[in-house]
Interface confidence: low
């Protein structure tokens, strides 16, 4: 039959050549002579002239060693013809198999291979994948068939067998406990791969597994007692600065250092911060503290990270014996500030109040009394006693120095400590109103017509408070009532002031008395202009001159 | 201020072992890689080991068998040991400091460097 | 090893024109977990130690004058001063800390012309 079965050869073949591969025969040869030729890709196409044929004979010929990772697999066709050219068979595919030889090494994807793992992680832990190939056949042979092994570790610490590597696959794992970046935080080992399945060629390459940080180490003070001297009161106060170790990385939260008061800070007197570059912790005054009350305290300090341990570690603990320092204190008003009702107007010398400190100091300090800040300069103080006096008038409508019936005084109290401390006080004076002001009334300049003229309305104005304000009364004296009207509007606190009689254009006084509540009364006297005019007017028309 | 210091005898015999110590100030002893390097008169620099902060170590293979380094931290002190000296191992030697102990700050390179000391080999 | 080569071996340039140094590494320098590449510069005047300009190829570091920048990646790298000055003149060289053993380029002379 004019069929040929798949030809096997054998790729970098080493001759000689031409080689006689299969013989191609047509049964029509009986008859007639038969001629054979070949073509296809590595015949009479690229590459071409890899394979011929015997034209009488049929007999196919490598003429060159195969090379299986160029071209695995040639398909050609034969052809047979009789001596006329006439075709006497139909083309026939002729499959030529390309089988491997072991003619190429393994070869790493890289040179050097980059990985990394958490210290202290389980044997078991995956850290990365290297890859090699092989350009030779893995299906059908184990010429591609690559095998990985780990040739060397550096460092050896703690041993020399701390990863291992997946045969197949090119998985590197931790085979052994006992990572610890603190002590080697980069292995570079050398890797292999080798064909066969192992029993080939081999070729190597590098990996770098880097050790990452984990918090396996606690930070530990160094030193672990501290004393320290504060003076009181100081708010704010550097105290100590404490010192811890750490051997993770620093600047990593591993390393960055966390503190707490965990004892003798009963009355929530210090705070604790960390530096954000020493990592120190910062011990500081919260609130002033009292030589008086206690002159010592004792302060226990916790130390953590601000990342979690990643193993049950020892807590440091540090202590710190903070001496308290007498420093002479001030003395202090009691109460810091005093209110004391007082009537306005009463005689000079007369007592308002005693107004005085106390010294916190242990000592009976002598304090003398000033007074510091009185604006209108209306009271006086003893220096002995503390006694407040009156020096001048209390009014408490002067606006300059009263505020909503408040007049503000600041004292001072001085010890006679060394150097001498003062501390101030604030009198804070109610003013009580009497009834020293008569209604006034706004505006006291008028003008008005002297034929149908308007009314005018003035407000009333009283300085003092209810009751010493409306109902107000109105009454006109110096015989202005026999021009002039004047009537209170109780409703608004006005006065309506209205002309009776003719008047010829000028200038007038007219004489308003206004009485309010408690019959203060306050005479005033308004400037009226008549204009010669009708009705409403602003200002006097200038005279008419005829023509 | 970090400051790095060499120090050492200038003169060793060969096949003696060279020993030269680092002294670290203005920073804690173990909180960066300490470095060697050294430099023949004249040519180039050649990586020869470095100390990692909790006292691990990787050399130059080419050294390997030859060199030892060390930490002392009561005395801030790195030392180098160079065994079985010959006359190319005439260099100045320096120590110097990894940037950080991490790869991400870039550990590999070197920030702080000593001025050197000059180490001839000799009879 | 991985094997650093710079060039030029020397170079000469005038007084505020611009100075390129070139470093070749024998395999890539460049992990591709973080994208960066593991190339240092520095300078080194007569009598001193090496001074560390740049990192991670093209980071400056701390108080290095900004007419000196770094780029490049994977094998090919640049030092450039865009500006040369007379303090400029001494001896550069690029070092690769992508595996052990760390290792220097031979150094590139730096003159004024």
């Known amino acids: 039959d004019w069929v040929v079965a798949p030809i096997s050869v054998p790729e970098n073949g080493k001759g000689p050549f031409p080689q006689r591969l299969n013989q191609l025969k047509s049964n029509k040869d009986r008859d007639t002579k038969i001629f054979y030729s070949i073509t296809g890709p590595g015949a009479d196409s690229p590459p071409e002239g890899v394979f011929a044929v015997e034209k009488e004979t049929g007999w196919l010929l490598l003429n060159k060693p195969l090379d299986r990772e160029e071209i695995a697999k040639y398909e050609l066709f034969g052809h047979a013809v009789s001596e006329n050219g006439a075709s006497v068979e139909d083309p026939m595919n002729i499959s030529i198999i390309v089988t491997d030889q072991n003619d190429h090494k393994p070869k790493f994807t890289q040179d050097t291979f980059r990985g990394s793992v958490l210290e202290g992680v389980l044997p078991g832990t995956s850290v990365m994948q290297v890859t090699a190939t092989d350009e030779d056949d893995a299906i059908h042979t184990y010429n591609g068939v690559v095998a990985y092994s780990i040739h060397s570790q550096e460092p050896k610490d703690p041993h020399d067998l701390m990863f291992t590597i997946h045969r197949s696959t090119g998985t590197i794992s931790v085979i052994s406990s006992g990572l610890d970046r603190e002590k080697v935080p980069e292995y570079t080992l050398t890797i292999q791969a080798t064909d066969m399945d192992g029993d080939g060629s081999t070729t190597t390459a590098v990996a770098v597994v880097e050790i990452l940080d984990a918090n396996d180490n606690a930070p530990v003070f160094d030193p672990q007692k501290y004393e320290s001297h504060v003076p009181e009161n100081a708010v704010g106060h550097e105290v100590q600065r404490l010192t811890v170790t750490d051997l993770d990385a620093p600047n990593s939260p591993a390393w960055r250092a966390t503190y707490l008061i965990v004892g003798g800070d009963d009355g929530d007197h210090f705070t604790i911060a960390t530096h954000p570059e020493s990592n120190q912790g910062i011990l500081t005054t919260r609130k002033g503290l009292d030589f008086e009350a206690k002159n010592q305290h004792t302060l226990y300090v916790e130390v953590t990270n601000e990342a979690p341990f990643v193993l049950k570690l020892p807590t440091s603990t540090a202590t710190i014996v903070v001496h308290v320092e007498d420093v002479n204190e001030a003395p202090v008003f009691v109460p810091p500030s005093k209110v004391v009702e007082v009537q306005e107007g009463i005689p000079t010398g007369e007592a308002v109040c005693v107004y005085t400190a106390k010294d916190p100091d242990k000592e009976n300090q002598k304090i003398s009394y000033r007074i510091l800040r009185d604006p209108a300069g209306w009271l006086a103080m003893d220096p002995d006693s503390g006694q407040v006096t009156v020096a001048g008038t209390l009014d408490r409508e002067d606006e300059r120095f009263v505020r909503n019936n408040i007049y503000e005084v600041m004292v001072l109290a001085v010890d006679n400590g060394s150097p001498p401390t003062t501390g101030t006080g604030t009198l804070l004076l109610t003013l009580i109103d009497v009834n020293d002001h008569g209604p006034v009334p706004e505006p006291r300049e008028i003008t008005i017509c002297n034929q149908s003229p308007e009314s005018q309305v003035l407000n009333i104005t009283d300085k003092d408070l209810s009751p010493h304000t409306s109902p107000f009364q109105a009454q006109l004296t110096d015989d202005s009532d026999i021009y002039w009207m004047a009537e209170v509007n109780e409703k608004d606190d006005t006065v309506v002031l209205s002309l009776k009689k003719f008047l010829k254009q000028d200038t007038y006084d007219v004489h308003l008395s206004l009485s309010d509540h408690g019959n203060k009364e306050q005479l005033t006297v308004i400037r009226a202009t008549v204009c010669d005019c009708h009705g409403h007017v602003e200002k006097c028309p200038d005279p008419w001159k005829g023509g | 201020q970090v400051q790095l210091q060499e120090s050492g005898p200038g003169l060793v015999k060969p096949s003696e072992t060279l020993s030269l110590t680092c002294t670290v100030s203005?920073?804690?002893?173990?909180?960066?890689?300490i470095n060697w390097i050294r430099q023949p008169p004249g040519k180039g620099l050649e990586w020869i080991g470095v100390?990692?902060?909790?006292?691990?170590?990787n050399y130059n293979p080419s050294l390997k068998s030859r060199v030892t380094i060390s930490v002392d931290t009561s005395k801030n002190q790195f030392s180098l040991k160079l065994s079985s000296v010959t006359a190319a191992d005439t260099a100045v030697y320096y120590c110097a400091r990894s940037r950080g102990v991490y790869d991400f700050d870039g550990r590999g390179a070197m920030d702080y460097w000593g001025q050197g000391t000059l180490v001839t080999v000799s009879s | 090893d991985i094997v650093m080569t710079q060039s030029p071996a020397s170079l000469a340039v005038s007084l505020g024109e611009r100075a390129t140094i070139n470093c070749k590494s024998s395999?890539?320098?460049?992990?591709?977990?973080?994208?960066?590449?593991?190339l240092a510069w520095y300078q080194q005047k007569p009598g001193q130690p090496p001074k560390l300009l740049i990192y991670?190829?093209?980071t400056r570091e701390s108080g290095v004058p900004d007419r000196f920048s770094g780029s490049g990646s994977g094998t090919d790298f640049t030092l450039t001063i865009s500006s040369l000055q007379a303090e400029d003149v001494a001896v550069y060289y690029c070092?690769?800390?992508?595996?052990?053993?760390?290792?220097f380029g031979q150094g590139t002379k730096l003159e004024i012309k």
């Open positions: 203005g920073v804690s002893i173990t909180s960066y890689p």
């Open positions: 070092q690769q800390y992508y595996s052990y053993p760390y290792t």
């Open positions: 100390i990692w902060t909790g006292g691990g170590t």
């Open positions: 991670w190829a093209s």
């Open positions: 395999q890539s320098l460049l992990y591709s977990s973080n994208q960066k590449n593991y």
